[in-house]
């Protein structure tokens, strides 16, 4: 065949593409009633020509429906708003085990859509604590377990510790562990772990604080070393002699127990008796000498001195001046100038 | 020097009983708490029952609640592990390990569970 | 249970070698999580607690780290007695393991 030229016409133009079914821009959230202020619920969807919201699977009256409409900026689609209120009566009206509940449904040419369910609870949070910390007494770097179980709440309550007022946070102090079902550990008390402890559970409604457990962590005495040895009572013979030690390895803290068993101890000692040293008998003159004198000597030997006994006090020698036997006095003069030293010399010690 | 000993542990038919000690030194175990992990032929470590004394505070892993039973004779200072109904999953190797921190170990004891 | 999902299952390094080995918890678990290191036939050793907390004892090559529920053990060089089995545990909930790295010689 021979090319016309012309263009073939389609058999049908392409219509304007059909309208979607509803998006929601906007579901209903989970919300709590606190006290007797009514929560708002609100919807928002496009393209959507209605918005009705359906509580407990009934329709809710056309009056309760707040709407606004306007054109989305991006898309220029018609969006639909709608909030409905749903006060703590209503609520309470609705008997049956199932909480009360809420969901928007939108319409556009192309059908239906639902949006998610909302569930609307009335807030609260019992006085009274299912469990609350015990004040304990532990030894230094021993383990503390503190347990809480918060009131029963709606929503459910969150916890947190106080000690001495301050929240704990255990990733600034590693030393303390929080756990799922909030009990609070010590690792390793330590000294400035000894404080007022409080579970503190706080929802929307309120907060709550538990009684104060006060944790002591205390420290046991400890024996120092023992001292030496007293010196034995008695210088001589039999006596006693004593040594200590004191409850101040650690001392006891914060109520720790003090030291078991004796602060000092005594044992008898015998110590031997010192012996002082006594002078022998002099013994006899010796002759007289050339230079005129004689001499005579002792020694301390009767007793010698023992066991750290005193020596003997005096001379071991004795010298006089003598005229006889050797002695050649007739050679010196009376003007002698050196004559007076053998009288002195009486009383001179040699040794 | 801290030291834990288990010991208890051994071969016992299905739905049998069986109960594991662990024997502390070194430390009172009334201010620690106990746990008891197990650890299977080849396998992962599972974290089975924990004891507090001095809070009466226990705890069990879903596995092992209302057949297993943690305690504490702190007189002894010692922790017990009692196992009834015992399946053969629950064989394993036993550890006890102290404090939370599971800071100290035991050495471990089997557990077989086979007819 | 909060479930700890431990990467990689087993490792191949040299000495000398950086290694990390992650965690990741399915929820928060705060910073209550523990590293031990076990060898076989023998019991698990603790090694960083509170995420980063190095036990006393344990040489410094080792450290720990926490970003949101991720957690990562870090051994800076690997020496030759670090071949062994690697365990993080969360006790923020009922105890809960990782399923373990195995750290093998390349």
């Known amino acids: 065949g021979t090319d016309s030229g012309s263009e073939v016409l389609p058999d049908s133009f392409p219509s304007a593409p059909a309208e979607p079914l509803p998006y929601f821009l906007q579901e209903p959230q989970d919300a709590y009633i606190v006290k007797n202020k009514p929560v708002e619920l609100r919807c928002r969807a496009f393209p959507a020509t209605q918005i009705y919201f359906k509580c407990n699977g009934e329709w809710v009256s056309q009056n309760d429906h707040v709407t606004q409409e306007g054109l989305d900026e991006a898309t220029g689609l018609r969006v639909r708003e709608v909030q409905i209120e749903v006060s703590r009566q209503q609520v309470e009206e609705l008997f049956g085990l199932e909480d009360y509940w809420c969901q928007c449904v939108a319409w556009s040419s192309a059908g239906t859509t639902k949006s998610r369910r909302a569930y609307v609870r009335i807030a609260y949070l019992r006085k009274n604590f299912d469990q609350e910390p015990l004040g304990k007494e532990v030894p230094l770097d021993h383990e503390v377990l503190l347990q809480c179980r918060p009131p029963e709440g709606v929503p459910v309550a969150e916890v947190e510790w106080l000690k001495n007022e301050d929240v704990i946070d255990p990733t600034q102090d590693t030393n303390f562990l929080l756990t799922i079902d909030h009990n609070l550990i010590i690792r390793q008390a330590r000294l400035s772990d000894t404080a007022n402890y409080t579970c503190v559970a706080k929802n929307i409604v309120a907060k709550r604080r538990s009684t104060t457990a006060t944790v002591i962590v205390y420290v046991n005495g400890g024996w120092s070393s023992w001292a030496e040895w007293s010196p034995c009572s008695n210088r001589c013979g039999r006596g006693w002699q004593k040594r200590t030690r004191t409850c101040t390895n650690p001392a006891p803290l914060n109520g720790g127990a003090f030291c078991e068993g004796q602060a000092f101890q005594k044992t008898a000692c015998t110590t031997i008796c010192p012996v002082d040293g006594a002078w022998t008998e002099w013994s006899k003159w010796s002759a007289c000498s050339t230079e005129c004198a004689h001499w005579r000597s002792r020694e301390c030997m009767a007793p010698p001195p023992q066991n750290g006994g005193r020596d003997c006090s005096g001379t071991l020698l004795d010298s006089k001046n003598c005229t006889d036997g050797l002695c050649m006095q007739n050679k010196k003069t009376l003007s002698d100038p050196n004559s007076h030293l053998l009288e002195a010399s009486g009383d001179a010690a040699l040794y | 020097e801290v030291q834990l000993v288990e010991s208890g542990g051994g071969l016992v038919q299905p739905g049998g009983s069986l109960r594991l000690s662990c024997a502390a030194s070194?430390?009172?175990?009334?201010?620690?708490?106990m746990h008891w992990v197990r650890q299977a032929p080849g396998k992962g470590l599972e974290w089975v029952a924990s004891?507090?004394?001095?809070?009466?505070?226990?705890s069990y892993a879903d596995s092992v609640k209302g057949r297993f039973t943690i305690s504490a004779d702190t007189s002894k200072n010692t922790a017990y592990l009692q196992m009834n109904s015992l399946r053969a999953e629950d064989t394993a190797v036993y550890y006890c390990?102290?404090?939370?921190?599971?800071?100290?170990w035991g050495q471990g004891t089997l557990v077989t569970v086979s007819s | 249970d909060i479930q700890m999902t431990q990467s990689p299952s087993s490792l191949s390094a040299s000495v000398g070698d950086r290694v990390t080995i992650t965690c990741r918890a399915s929820?928060?678990?705060?910073?209550?999580v523990a590293w031990y290191q076990q060898k076989p036939g023998k019991a698990p050793k603790l090694l960083i607690y509170?995420?980063?907390s190095l036990y006393s004892g344990v040489p410094s090559r080792f450290s720990g780290s926490r970003s949101g529920t991720d957690f990562t053990l870090t051994i800076s060089s690997l020496q030759p007695e670090d071949f062994a089995t690697y365990y993080c545990?969360?006790?923020?909930?009922?105890?809960?393991f990782g399923q373990g790295t195995k750290v093998e010689i390349k």
């Open positions: 929820q928060s678990v705060s910073s209550a």
């Open positions: 004891i507090y004394s001095y809070s009466s505070y226990t």
């Open positions: 390990a102290r404090s939370y921190a599971m800071d100290y």
């Open positions: 509170s995420a980063s």
């Open positions: 545990q969360q006790s923020y909930g009922p105890f809960t």
């Open positions: 070194g430390f009172n175990l009334y201010y620690y708490s």
